[in-house]
């Protein structure tokens, strides 16, 4: 039950983080205009990873897309990649982790080939994670870079009198968006992994030996469990220290290493 | 056509309260903001404030502590209201309608004179 | 507050000349997330509200001879009158859009001989 529990909540907190990494990736505030120590302004910017728009106070906003891939800075397309790799990512995780789910049944799949496919998902989750928080954490340095350096010379007088303020930006709404998501997606991954492990089969599952005793035929069927005596106790190789209960992970299934106490 | 029509008092004595309505026609009145701008006589413009279309509102900071800027979605109706007025707040008062993606105030009332005297 | 100066304070021309009148801001009018200028020019003739002439610093509103330019980029900005008629009479201002208070200039008079 709690490995079915930890896949089924991985794979919910996987699908909430993609979701959102796919909605920061598409938000136009991943920078916003600095009002901080600036004049009173009736002319809001704000840019994204597409786009730059233009909010202005009568609420009419102006949105102009990036028409050019060359002339783009490289640490904006290296996020736009890292972004995209984590969605692509994601999304195929998705799509595996759904077959790999323990309480969706297709066919006669093999508990061992849901625990690949949950591990393979779960890894999936955690590469889409990292590369949305690094992409994220890229904007966010780039971000923090320029704002020093749009700092150090915010003001150029012109003859004592003119002021030109260069426009700063700081975080949007779009980096703590990523950065949340990534991390969920990150756990969902996680706990994919873990839940992988509580799918696997025993590795050393034997097949009975008979042994012929003189006098008496007697099969020898060991459980494979230390509690077990091996002598025709615990035949179907199910846990002895249940007190008779059956849980759902137990019906139909191998037991698993990882299933002593 | 749109229109904006201002209507005041005309005089107003000292240390009175000041109150305008701008009723506007021949357009949205939920999709504009709406400006006030004054002229004392022989003087340039002042501006007043503004309510945007969703009803917030600026104020020029000097005049903030005694203007108030409202309005009446129903009867497409703005209203400035000016306290403690002074002789100096003489002047013709403009409501002008928000150019909205265009730069400046693109349509403006005919003004009405407030004229501060006892 | 942003000032707007405008100089000159008057001028008078003969009808069919050429007349430039100039507008200086004390910051830079000029947005850079869309690279708009934040100034627009009115024309005020006697006994009349203003009228908006440009905005955008070059735009002209709909319905005004061709004959008026707007001109110039973030601080330093131009009105320009190609061949001035004589119904041109009026006080022109420049006013910032960007900033708040939004602040007029004090005017140029155009005085036709």
């Known amino acids: 039950m709690a490995v079915t529990a930890c896949q089924g909540l991985g794979f919910v907190v996987s699908l909430i983080g993609i979701a959102g990494i796919i909605a920061a990736t598409c938000m136009d505030q991943w920078s916003t205009q600095d009002l901080y120590n600036n004049p009173v302004t009736a002319v809001f910017n704000y840019q994204g990873l597409w786009r730059s728009c233009v909010r202005e106070s009568s609420g009419f906003t102006e949105c102009r897309g990036y028409f050019t891939l060359l002339g783009l800075p490289a640490m904006l397309q290296a996020v736009r990649a890292l972004m995209i790799v984590g969605i692509v990512l994601g999304a195929i995780g998705l799509l595996v982790s759904i077959f790999a789910l323990k309480c969706i049944r297709i066919g006669s799949m093999e508990d061992s080939a849901k625990a690949n496919m949950t591990l393979t998902s779960g890894i999936m989750f955690i590469v889409s994670g990292l590369c949305a928080i690094a992409g994220v954490s890229v904007f966010a340095n780039m971000l923090v870079t320029n704002f020093w350096m749009s700092t150090a010379n915010m003001y150029t007088g012109m003859g004592g009198m003119v002021q030109t303020v260069q426009t700063r930006y700081t975080f949007g709404a779009a980096l703590f968006v990523g950065w949340v998501a990534g991390g969920l997606t990150l756990i969902g991954g996680v706990m994919m992994c873990i839940a992988c492990r509580g799918l696997a089969p025993e590795e050393t599952n034997y097949k009975a030996v008979s042994y012929h005793a003189s006098g008496h035929s007697v099969a020898y069927k060991p459980g494979g469990f230390k509690a077990s005596t091996g002598f025709g106790s615990n035949t179907k190789n199910k846990k002895i220290y249940d007190g008779g209960a059956r849980t759902e992970d137990e019906v139909q299934s191998y037991p698993s290493k990882h299933d002593y106490v | 056509q749109v229109q904006l029509k201002e209507s005041g008092p005309g005089l107003v004595a000292p240390s009175q309260s000041l109150s305008i309505t701008c009723t506007v026609s021949?357009?949205?009145?939920?999709?504009?903001?709406v400006h006030w701008v004054r002229q004392p006589p022989g003087k340039g413009l002042e501006w007043l404030g503004v309510i945007w279309a969703g009803g917030s509102t600026d104020y020029n900071a000097a005049l903030m502590s005694r203007l108030s800027i409202r309005k009446d979605n129903s009867k497409s109706q703005v209203f400035l209201k000016m306290n403690s007025l002074q002789i100096a707040d003489t002047a013709m008062y403009y409501c002008a309608r928000d150019g909205h993606g265009k730069v400046g105030f693109d349509v403006w009332g005919a003004g009405t004179t407030v004229t501060v005297s006892s | 507050d942003i000032v707007m100066t405008q100089s000159p304070s008057s001028l008078s021309v003969s009808a069919g000349e050429k007349v430039t009148m100039n507008c200086k801001s004390s910051?830079?009018?000029?947005?850079?997330?869309?690279?708009?200028?934040?100034l627009a020019w009115y024309q005020q003739k006697p006994g009349q509200p203003p009228k908006l002439l440009i905005y955008g610093a070059s735009t002209r509103e709909s319905g005004v001879p061709d004959r008026f330019t707007g001109g110039g980029s973030g601080t330093d900005f131009t009105l320009t009158i190609s061949s001035v008629q004589a119904e041109d009479l009026a006080i022109y201002y420049c006013q910032n859009d960007h900033f708040y208070p939004f602040t007029f200039g004090s005017g140029t008079k155009l005085e036709i001989k």
């Open positions: 021949g357009f949205s009145f939920t999709s504009y903001g």
């Open positions: 910051q830079s009018l000029l947005n850079s997330g869309n690279q708009k200028n934040y």
